[in-house]
């Protein structure tokens, strides 16, 4: 008789990540009798689920069960039905609903209901849905990038996991760029975290880390996108707004209510002579960039040195892994190499911005417009936020690693958050353990 | 001090339109939700119309949906309300209410109120 | 719509005496009640948020609790000053308010 395969003793989790312009859906897999092991869980699947962010459904709350329905669905194919009992659900709101909360506590839990009772529906294990801290969303991506580096695992490794993993035990810093927040988190070297709210405390596998991590609610990059366009408008002579974020050619009508539709743009907020106005682009890198610095309050710091708008900044230390829309943007920039100096970045940029935006749409024409009329915009931001707000250098710029996926797992907060959840993560070193009975299978 | 004062109230014959304004001072007027509560002679308190802070929250109760419309000029710190096609029933004193604050986090109830301005829709 | 029903329409009490208000609703609203004092002739006075929260400038005699579909609102000894129609108000759907409680003077 033929030998039958043993049913692969794993374990699954689901994580949706329900940011401020979409919603993704991620499985995670692991072995079930390596729970405590570094780097044993990995991505199985990743479900874009179609249409905005959840906070964009606060007066159709009733089509938010449709919404994630697809999504759903997949999660139940993938998963075996045996497991799907045994399957937590856990679903993270970040700074899109953390802006409609501060609107209004009762939409933001409304919304928060009718997910809930939504993914209820399905017969997974629901752990809740809720709304992240921006330093939970920082820690839980330093977290995952270093979980999947293998950092907190004590044992040496002669070879190297990926390209850019320096063979130390030193952490990575975390870069993580949202439509509607941005996070650095990253152990300082030495240094006291000046400001309480930013340090973080961990002990994982029996050593202990002081981290710094701060989230800039209002600074993703389509919150930083309106508030440019909020900050210009103030100034235009009329109901054209010549943008240099944007390529030449480029036009745009804009409603100003939709301008003044977020808390971001509070502070630039001002009655303006007309209902609406024209973007037309200049695509000029230079003046972009210009215009972002103005975002970005550096002439105020009540610590030894700030990032900006007052923020505690310590100095820089060791390798930084930049994921989410960093790597998308620099991604579709093919500026993502380990080769591409800070200047040469700086450089393509300049050229990327000033081509005609007809050219740039016959270049790219699988692209959507709305995408593809804002990457000089989001790079230029990029450029600007990492050197002036986060200070880095020509010199430690080769220490930005731009990261999409780790072993097959995609860089962002959701592992950590479900690592954390399923207590996954020790605060000591697991004991070496005798051989388990599936390995001898 | 926080101060909501209402105007634009009169008399009115059913069929016929109205704008209510409110004139806010004492409090960063584009950080709150603004609303209309109403209320009939000798009867309770009924919600009408809300705009939270930045405006992504415009409703309106199912008695006044389709004939009101509330908006707000936050450069002139100033809540309205147009009614038109006006009811015997919608005869009532308006407040203008200011949404209140849990924390950091905007609040659906009502922290201040103005005195009203009486509406009479007779012929 | 979430309908609220205070009972009793009509307390009456007699001054340094405690008072009871109740509000039932009729789905559950979380903690999303508040309540307000009206007098004639003025517009209503926010007395508590939240289900339990003192608003600003409110004595500490009145005090409230409950979440789901039960509140209650608590003036622990009245003074003559309280006399007056008490209204809840849920905010977890889009507002509504109860009919009213008059306290007046036993």
């Known amino acids: 008789t033929q030998n039958k395969a043993l049913p692969e003793n794993v374990k699954y989790g689901i994580v949706l990540d329900a940011g401020s312009s979409h919603t993704s859906l991620y499985i995670y897999k692991w072995p079930a009798e390596k729970e405590n092991d570094t780097g044993v869980v990995h991505q199985v699947e990743e479900c874009r689920v179609k249409g905005p962010g959840i906070s964009k459904f606060v007066q159709k709350v009733n089509e938010i069960g449709i919404y994630l329905t697809d999504c759903m669905e997949r999660a139940r194919e993938v998963i075996p039905r045996s497991q799907h009992q045994e399957t937590p659900v856990y679903l993270g709101a970040t700074a899109g609903m953390r802006l409609l909360r501060m609107e209004s506590e009762e939409l933001a839990d409304r919304v928060l209901d009718v997910v809930e009772r939504s993914l209820s529906n399905y017969p997974f294990d629901f752990q809740g849905a809720r709304i992240i801290t921006g330093q939970e969303e920082g820690a839980y991506g330093w977290i995952t990038i270093n979980y999947l580096l293998g950092k907190f695992s004590q044992k040496t490794r002669w070879f190297s996991i990926v390209p850019y993993e320096t063979n130390n035990q030193e952490t990575f810093g975390a870069l993580d760029l949202g439509g509607a927040s941005t996070q650095v988190t990253f152990v300082p070297q030495n240094q006291t975290i000046e400001s309480p709210d930013n340090a973080l405390q961990f002990r994982l596998y029996g050593k202990d880390y002081n981290v710094y991590t701060h989230s800039f609610l209002c600074y993703g990059k389509d919150q930083a996108l309106w508030q440019k366009l909020a900050k210009d408008i103030q100034v235009a002579s009329n109901e054209i707004l010549r943008d240099p974020c944007f390529h030449p050619g480029y036009k745009k009508v804009v409603n100003v209510s939709d301008l003044y539709k977020t808390p971001c743009t509070k502070r630039f907020e001002m009655t303006l002579p007309f209902q609406q106005f024209e973007i037309q682009g200049i695509g000029n890198y230079q003046q972009c960039h210009q215009s972002i610095l103005e975002l970005f309050n550096t002439s105020y710091c009540p610590y030894s040195q700030c990032a900006f708008n007052g923020i505690f900044l310590p100095p820089l230390q060791g390798d930084f892994g930049a994921f989410s829309a960093f790597y998308f943007v620099m991604k579709f920039l093919n500026l993502t190499s380990e080769k591409v100096s800070q200047e040469k970045v700086t450089e393509m940029m300049k050229k990327f911005c000033a081509q005609p935006w007809e050219e740039i749409k016959t270049s790219y024409a699988g692209v959507k417009e709305k995408y593809l009329s804002e990457y000089c915009f989001s790079g230029t931001y990029i450029l600007s936020l990492l050197l002036q707000g986060y200070h880095f250098t020509a010199d430690s710029w080769e220490h930005i690693h731009f990261i999409g996926k780790i072993q097959g797992s995609d860089a962002g907060w959701t592992l950590g958050y479900m690592l954390n959840l399923t207590n996954m993560i020790p605060a000591e070193q697991p004991l070496s353990t005798p051989l388990s009975h599936s390995t001898y299978v | 001090e926080v101060q909501l004062v209402e105007s634009g109230g009169g008399l009115v014959q059913p069929g016929r339109s109205l704008r209510l304004s409110c004139a806010a001072s004492?409090?960063?007027?584009?950080?709150?939700?603004m609303n209309w509560v109403r209320q009939a002679p000798g009867k309770g308190l009924e919600w009408v119309s809300s705009f939270s802070s930045s405006s992504t929250y415009i409703s309106y109760a199912d008695t006044v949906k389709g004939r009101f419309t509330i908006s707000r000029d936050n450069a002139k710190n100033s809540l309205y309300l147009q009614m038109n096609s006006l009811r015997a029933e919608d005869t009532a004193l308006y407040y203008c209410?200011?949404?209140?604050?849990?924390?950091?986090?905007?609040?659906?109830?009502?922290?201040?109120w103005g005195q009203g301005t009486m509406v009479t829709v007779s012929s | 719509e979430t309908v609220m029903t205070q009972s009793p329409a009509t307390l009456s009490v007699s001054p340094g005496e405690r008072a009871t208000l109740s509000c039932r609703a009729s789905?559950?609203?979380?903690?999303?009640m508040h309540w307000y004092q009206q007098k004639p002739g003025q517009a209503p006075r926010l007395l508590i948020y939240k289900a339990s929260n003192l608003a600003s400038g409110i004595p500490a005699r009145f005090s409230g609790s409950g979440s789901g579909t039960e509140f209650t609102l608590t003036i622990s000894s009245l003074q003559s000053e309280d006399f007056a129609v008490y209204y809840c108000?849920?905010?977890?759907?889009?507002?509504?308010f109860g009919q009213g409680t008059k306290l007046e003077l036993k």
């Open positions: 789905e559950g609203v979380k903690s999303y």
């Open positions: 108000q849920q905010s977890w759907n889009d507002p509504t």
């Open positions: 004492g409090f960063t007027f584009n950080n709150y939700g």
């Open positions: 209410a200011r949404h209140g604050r849990y924390g950091g986090y905007g609040g659906f109830y009502f922290d201040y």
